[in-house]
Protein backbone atom coordinates (compact mmCIF):
# COMPACT_ATOMS: atom_id res chain seq x y z
CA UNK A 1 0.00 0.00 0.00
CA UNK A 2 1.42 3.40 -1.02
CA UNK A 3 0.96 6.05 1.70
CA UNK A 4 -0.62 9.39 0.66
CA UNK A 5 1.23 12.72 0.49
CA UNK A 6 1.42 14.49 3.84
CA UNK A 7 0.80 18.10 4.91
CA UNK A 8 -0.90 19.03 1.64
CA UNK A 9 -1.48 22.78 1.51
CA UNK A 10 -1.77 25.69 -0.91
CA UNK A 11 0.88 28.38 -0.76
CA UNK A 12 -0.61 31.29 -2.68
CA UNK A 13 0.84 34.81 -2.79
CA UNK A 14 -0.47 37.36 -5.30
CA UNK A 15 -2.19 34.49 -7.16
CA UNK A 16 1.01 32.51 -7.58
CA UNK A 17 -0.69 29.31 -6.46
CA UNK A 18 1.70 26.54 -5.49
CA UNK A 19 0.24 23.30 -4.14
CA UNK A 20 2.79 21.84 -1.75
CA UNK A 21 3.08 18.54 0.10
CA UNK A 22 5.59 16.29 1.80
CA UNK A 23 6.67 12.85 0.66
CA UNK A 24 5.67 10.14 3.13
CA UNK A 25 8.14 7.57 4.39
CA UNK A 26 8.18 4.66 1.94
CA UNK A 27 10.66 1.79 2.17
CA UNK A 28 10.34 0.35 -1.34
CA UNK A 29 11.82 3.30 -3.24
CA UNK A 30 11.26 6.84 -4.49
CA UNK A 31 7.70 8.00 -4.92
CA UNK A 32 6.32 10.13 -7.72
CA UNK A 33 3.23 12.31 -7.51
CA UNK A 34 0.32 13.38 -9.68
CA UNK A 35 -1.66 16.56 -8.95
CA UNK A 36 -4.99 17.39 -10.58
CA UNK A 37 -7.71 20.04 -10.55
CA UNK A 38 -11.44 19.69 -11.07
CA UNK A 39 -12.64 21.27 -14.30
CA UNK A 40 -16.22 20.92 -15.48
CA UNK A 41 -16.74 17.82 -13.29
CA UNK A 42 -13.64 16.09 -14.65
CA UNK A 43 -10.25 16.01 -12.95
CA UNK A 44 -7.46 17.22 -15.23
CA UNK A 45 -3.77 16.48 -14.74
CA UNK A 46 -1.60 19.46 -13.86
CA UNK A 47 1.61 17.73 -12.76
CA UNK A 48 2.04 14.09 -13.75
CA UNK A 49 4.49 11.58 -12.28
CA UNK A 50 6.61 14.36 -10.83
CA UNK A 51 9.35 13.77 -8.29
CA UNK A 52 8.81 17.31 -6.97
CA UNK A 53 6.69 17.97 -3.92
CA UNK A 54 4.91 20.97 -5.40
CA UNK A 55 2.77 21.87 -8.41
CA UNK A 56 2.01 25.29 -9.88
CA UNK A 57 -1.73 26.07 -10.22
CA UNK A 58 -1.31 29.77 -11.03
CA UNK A 59 -3.33 29.38 -14.24
CA UNK A 60 -6.55 28.69 -12.32
CA UNK A 61 -9.37 31.21 -12.48
CA UNK A 62 -9.06 33.71 -9.65
CA UNK A 63 -12.75 33.27 -8.93
CA UNK A 64 -14.63 30.36 -7.39
CA UNK A 65 -13.78 27.30 -5.34
CA UNK A 66 -11.32 24.90 -6.92
CA UNK A 67 -10.92 21.29 -5.88
CA UNK A 68 -7.33 20.10 -6.17
CA UNK A 69 -5.96 16.69 -5.35
CA UNK A 70 -2.62 14.90 -5.22
CA UNK A 71 -1.57 11.28 -4.79
CA UNK A 72 1.66 9.33 -4.43
CA UNK A 73 2.66 6.62 -6.90
CA UNK A 74 5.14 3.77 -7.00
CA UNK A 75 5.35 1.42 -10.00
CA UNK A 76 1.75 0.32 -10.65
CA UNK A 77 0.53 1.23 -7.18
CA UNK A 78 -0.81 4.52 -5.91
CA UNK A 79 -2.12 6.09 -2.73
CA UNK A 80 -5.56 7.51 -2.10
CA UNK A 81 -6.07 11.07 -3.31
CA UNK A 82 -5.67 13.92 -0.84
CA UNK A 83 -8.13 16.71 -1.70
CA UNK A 84 -8.09 20.39 -0.82
CA UNK A 85 -10.43 23.22 -1.75
CA UNK A 86 -8.97 26.60 -2.68
CA UNK A 87 -10.56 29.90 -3.66
CA UNK A 88 -7.81 32.16 -5.00
CA UNK A 89 -9.54 35.52 -4.57
CA UNK A 90 -10.35 34.70 -0.95
CA UNK A 91 -7.31 32.68 0.02
CA UNK A 92 -4.32 34.23 -1.72
CA UNK A 93 -1.96 36.17 0.51
CA UNK A 94 -1.53 39.83 -0.42
CA UNK A 95 2.18 40.35 -0.81
CA UNK A 96 3.96 43.57 0.15
CA UNK A 97 3.53 46.57 -2.15
CA UNK A 98 6.48 48.43 -3.59
CA UNK A 99 7.32 51.83 -2.23
CA UNK A 100 9.46 54.73 -3.38
CA UNK A 101 10.49 57.25 -0.74
CA UNK A 102 12.06 60.65 -1.36
CA UNK A 103 13.16 63.18 1.23
CA UNK A 104 12.33 66.81 0.59
CA UNK A 105 13.49 68.96 3.52
CA UNK A 106 11.33 67.98 6.51
CA UNK A 107 8.92 65.87 4.43
CA UNK A 108 8.88 62.29 3.19
CA UNK A 109 7.24 61.81 -0.20
CA UNK A 110 6.05 58.25 -0.76
CA UNK A 111 4.68 56.49 -3.83
CA UNK A 112 3.10 53.06 -3.57
CA UNK A 113 3.06 50.31 -6.18
CA UNK A 114 0.46 47.56 -5.92
CA UNK A 115 1.88 44.04 -6.12
CA UNK A 116 2.15 42.47 -9.54
CA UNK A 117 0.24 39.27 -10.26
CA UNK A 118 1.49 35.96 -11.59
CA UNK A 119 0.26 35.18 -15.13
CA UNK A 120 -1.02 38.70 -15.77
CA UNK A 121 -0.13 41.69 -17.88
CA UNK A 122 2.44 43.94 -16.23
CA UNK A 123 -0.13 46.68 -15.60
CA UNK A 124 -2.85 44.42 -14.13
CA UNK A 125 -2.04 44.47 -10.41
CA UNK A 126 -3.73 43.48 -7.16
CA UNK A 127 -5.42 46.88 -7.27
CA UNK A 128 -7.32 45.79 -10.39
CA UNK A 129 -8.52 42.59 -8.75
CA UNK A 130 -9.83 44.12 -5.52
CA UNK A 131 -12.13 47.12 -5.93
CA UNK A 132 -11.72 48.25 -2.33
CA UNK A 133 -7.91 48.15 -2.46
CA UNK A 134 -6.25 50.70 -0.26
CA UNK A 135 -2.93 51.13 1.52
CA UNK A 136 -2.01 51.22 5.18
CA UNK A 137 1.17 53.10 6.00
CA UNK A 138 2.96 53.00 9.30
CA UNK A 139 5.93 55.16 10.20
CA UNK A 140 8.07 55.77 13.22
CA UNK A 141 11.12 57.62 14.37
CA UNK A 142 14.05 55.22 14.04
CA UNK A 143 15.02 53.81 17.40
CA UNK A 144 11.62 54.41 18.99
CA UNK A 145 8.74 52.01 19.57
CA UNK A 146 5.81 54.33 18.92
CA UNK A 147 4.30 53.75 15.46
CA UNK A 148 1.84 55.99 13.65
CA UNK A 149 -0.63 54.63 11.07
CA UNK A 150 -2.30 56.44 8.20
CA UNK A 151 -4.52 55.32 5.32
CA UNK A 152 -3.61 57.27 2.18
CA UNK A 153 -6.43 58.04 -0.24
CA UNK A 154 -4.20 57.71 -3.28
CA UNK A 155 -1.10 55.89 -4.51
CA UNK A 156 1.06 58.53 -2.87
CA UNK A 157 1.35 60.27 0.48
CA UNK A 158 3.44 63.03 2.02
CA UNK A 159 4.49 63.08 5.65
CA UNK A 160 5.03 66.75 6.40
CA UNK A 161 6.49 68.80 9.24
CA UNK A 162 8.73 66.02 10.48
CA UNK A 163 11.63 66.72 12.81
CA UNK A 164 14.68 67.86 10.83
CA UNK A 165 17.81 65.75 10.71
CA UNK A 166 15.87 62.78 12.04
CA UNK A 167 15.64 59.27 10.58
CA UNK A 168 12.11 58.02 9.99
CA UNK A 169 11.16 54.50 8.91
CA UNK A 170 8.14 53.77 6.75
CA UNK A 171 6.41 50.59 5.59
CA UNK A 172 3.25 49.93 3.62
CA UNK A 173 0.78 47.10 3.12
CA UNK A 174 -2.30 46.50 1.03
CA UNK A 175 -5.63 46.49 2.83
CA UNK A 176 -9.13 45.44 1.70
CA UNK A 177 -11.72 47.23 3.86
CA UNK A 178 -14.66 45.27 2.45
CA UNK A 179 -13.00 41.99 3.47
CA UNK A 180 -11.16 43.35 6.50
CA UNK A 181 -8.11 41.65 5.03
CA UNK A 182 -4.59 43.00 5.40
CA UNK A 183 -1.58 42.13 3.28
CA UNK A 184 2.03 41.69 4.25
CA UNK A 185 4.06 44.72 5.30
CA UNK A 186 6.83 45.86 3.00
CA UNK A 187 10.37 45.98 4.35
CA UNK A 188 10.91 49.25 6.26
CA UNK A 189 12.56 52.07 4.34
CA UNK A 190 14.45 54.48 6.58
CA UNK A 191 15.40 57.99 5.45
CA UNK A 192 16.80 61.02 7.24
CA UNK A 193 15.01 64.33 6.90
CA UNK A 194 17.10 67.42 6.28
CA UNK A 195 16.51 71.03 7.31
CA UNK A 196 13.23 72.63 8.30
CA UNK A 197 11.88 74.57 5.31
CA UNK A 198 10.51 77.45 7.36
CA UNK A 199 12.30 80.74 6.81
CA UNK A 200 13.45 82.56 9.99
CA UNK A 201 11.82 85.98 10.45
Amino acid sequence: MVPPPENVRMNSVNFKNILQWESPAFAKGNLTFTAQYLSYRIFQDKCMNTTLTECDFSSLSKYGDHTLRVRAEFADEHSDWVNITFCPVDDTIIGPPGMQVEVLADSLHMRFLAPKIENEYETWTMKNVYNSWTYNVQYWKNGTDEKFQITPQYDFEVLRNLEPWTTYCVQVRGFLPDRNKAGEWSEPVCEQTTHDETVPS
Epitope: S61, K62, N119
Partner: nanobody, 124 residues
Protein backbone atom coordinates in the same frame (compact mmCIF):
# COMPACT_ATOMS: atom_id res chain seq x y z
CA UNK B 1 -25.93 34.93 -21.15
CA UNK B 2 -23.82 37.18 -23.35
CA UNK B 3 -23.06 36.34 -26.97
CA UNK B 4 -19.93 37.76 -28.56
CA UNK B 5 -19.45 38.23 -32.29
CA UNK B 6 -16.08 39.25 -33.72
CA UNK B 7 -15.61 40.91 -37.11
CA UNK B 8 -13.00 42.89 -39.01
CA UNK B 9 -10.45 40.17 -39.73
CA UNK B 10 -8.90 39.64 -43.13
CA UNK B 11 -5.73 39.65 -45.18
CA UNK B 12 -3.38 42.60 -44.75
CA UNK B 13 0.19 43.36 -45.79
CA UNK B 14 2.99 43.73 -43.21
CA UNK B 15 2.93 47.24 -41.78
CA UNK B 16 -0.80 47.55 -42.45
CA UNK B 17 -3.72 48.07 -40.09
CA UNK B 18 -6.98 46.38 -39.17
CA UNK B 19 -9.70 47.15 -36.67
CA UNK B 20 -11.43 44.22 -35.04
CA UNK B 21 -14.86 44.59 -33.46
CA UNK B 22 -16.47 42.52 -30.74
CA UNK B 23 -20.22 43.07 -30.48
CA UNK B 24 -21.87 41.85 -27.28
CA UNK B 25 -25.53 40.97 -26.99
CA UNK B 26 -27.11 42.27 -23.81
CA UNK B 27 -25.32 44.90 -21.77
CA UNK B 28 -21.54 44.57 -22.04
CA UNK B 29 -21.25 46.66 -18.87
CA UNK B 30 -22.49 43.56 -17.03
CA UNK B 31 -19.12 42.04 -17.89
CA UNK B 32 -16.44 43.99 -16.06
CA UNK B 33 -13.58 42.85 -18.26
CA UNK B 34 -13.51 42.23 -22.00
CA UNK B 35 -10.37 40.68 -23.45
CA UNK B 36 -8.84 39.84 -26.80
CA UNK B 37 -6.93 36.60 -27.28
CA UNK B 38 -5.30 35.04 -30.31
CA UNK B 39 -4.25 31.61 -31.46
CA UNK B 40 -1.60 31.33 -34.15
CA UNK B 41 -1.56 28.20 -36.32
CA UNK B 42 -0.24 25.27 -34.29
CA UNK B 43 0.19 27.42 -31.17
CA UNK B 44 -1.68 27.86 -27.88
CA UNK B 45 -4.07 30.62 -26.92
CA UNK B 46 -2.31 33.87 -26.06
CA UNK B 47 -3.63 36.95 -24.26
CA UNK B 48 -3.42 40.14 -26.32
CA UNK B 49 -5.22 42.87 -24.42
CA UNK B 50 -8.12 43.64 -22.09
CA UNK B 51 -10.20 46.59 -21.01
CA UNK B 52 -11.93 47.14 -17.70
CA UNK B 53 -15.50 48.43 -17.81
CA UNK B 54 -15.43 50.30 -14.53
CA UNK B 55 -12.41 52.57 -14.91
CA UNK B 56 -11.70 51.90 -18.57
CA UNK B 57 -8.13 50.87 -17.85
CA UNK B 58 -6.38 49.09 -20.72
CA UNK B 59 -3.73 46.38 -20.56
CA UNK B 60 -1.52 44.81 -23.23
CA UNK B 61 0.82 41.92 -23.88
CA UNK B 62 4.41 43.04 -24.44
CA UNK B 63 4.32 41.71 -28.01
CA UNK B 64 1.62 44.21 -29.07
CA UNK B 65 2.29 47.18 -26.79
CA UNK B 66 2.50 50.42 -28.77
CA UNK B 67 0.95 48.83 -31.87
CA UNK B 68 -2.50 47.68 -30.70
CA UNK B 69 -5.15 49.79 -28.95
CA UNK B 70 -8.23 48.42 -27.21
CA UNK B 71 -11.30 50.59 -26.67
CA UNK B 72 -14.97 50.18 -25.93
CA UNK B 73 -18.16 51.95 -26.92
CA UNK B 74 -20.66 51.12 -24.21
CA UNK B 75 -23.55 52.69 -26.10
CA UNK B 76 -22.97 50.14 -28.88
CA UNK B 77 -21.96 47.30 -26.55
CA UNK B 78 -18.86 46.92 -28.69
CA UNK B 79 -15.16 46.55 -27.95
CA UNK B 80 -12.56 47.35 -30.60
CA UNK B 81 -8.99 46.27 -31.20
CA UNK B 82 -7.11 48.68 -33.45
CA UNK B 83 -4.08 46.86 -34.82
CA UNK B 84 -1.34 48.93 -36.47
CA UNK B 85 2.13 48.07 -37.82
CA UNK B 86 1.03 44.47 -38.30
CA UNK B 87 3.67 41.76 -38.61
CA UNK B 88 3.65 38.23 -39.97
CA UNK B 89 3.77 36.92 -36.41
CA UNK B 90 0.41 38.60 -35.69
CA UNK B 91 -1.25 36.07 -38.00
CA UNK B 92 -3.81 34.20 -35.88
CA UNK B 93 -7.46 33.67 -35.11
CA UNK B 94 -8.49 36.50 -32.78
CA UNK B 95 -11.08 35.84 -30.10
CA UNK B 96 -13.01 38.21 -27.90
CA UNK B 97 -13.98 37.06 -24.39
CA UNK B 98 -16.02 38.43 -21.49
CA UNK B 99 -15.41 37.94 -17.78
CA UNK B 100 -18.36 37.96 -15.41
CA UNK B 101 -16.22 38.55 -12.33
CA UNK B 102 -13.57 40.85 -13.78
CA UNK B 103 -10.79 39.62 -11.53
CA UNK B 104 -8.35 38.73 -14.29
CA UNK B 105 -7.19 40.08 -17.61
CA UNK B 106 -4.65 37.82 -19.30
CA UNK B 107 -5.55 34.27 -18.30
CA UNK B 108 -8.25 32.53 -20.34
CA UNK B 109 -9.39 30.78 -17.15
CA UNK B 110 -10.77 34.11 -15.92
CA UNK B 111 -13.20 34.46 -18.86
CA UNK B 112 -16.67 32.96 -19.04
CA UNK B 113 -17.90 33.74 -22.55
CA UNK B 114 -16.14 33.50 -25.89
CA UNK B 115 -16.78 34.50 -29.47
CA UNK B 116 -16.18 32.27 -32.46
CA UNK B 117 -13.09 34.17 -33.61
CA UNK B 118 -12.02 36.12 -36.68
CA UNK B 119 -8.99 35.26 -38.81
CA UNK B 120 -6.21 37.80 -39.30
CA UNK B 121 -3.56 37.01 -41.90
CA UNK B 122 -0.52 39.26 -42.31
CA UNK B 123 1.28 38.41 -45.52
CA UNK B 124 2.73 40.08 -48.59
Amino acid sequence: EVQLVESGGGLVQPGGSLRLSCAASGNSLDYPTIGWFRQAPGKGLEGVSCISASEGSTHYADAVKGRFTISRDNSKNTVYLQMNSLRAEDTAVYYCAASGHGLGCKSEADYDYWGQGTMVTVSS
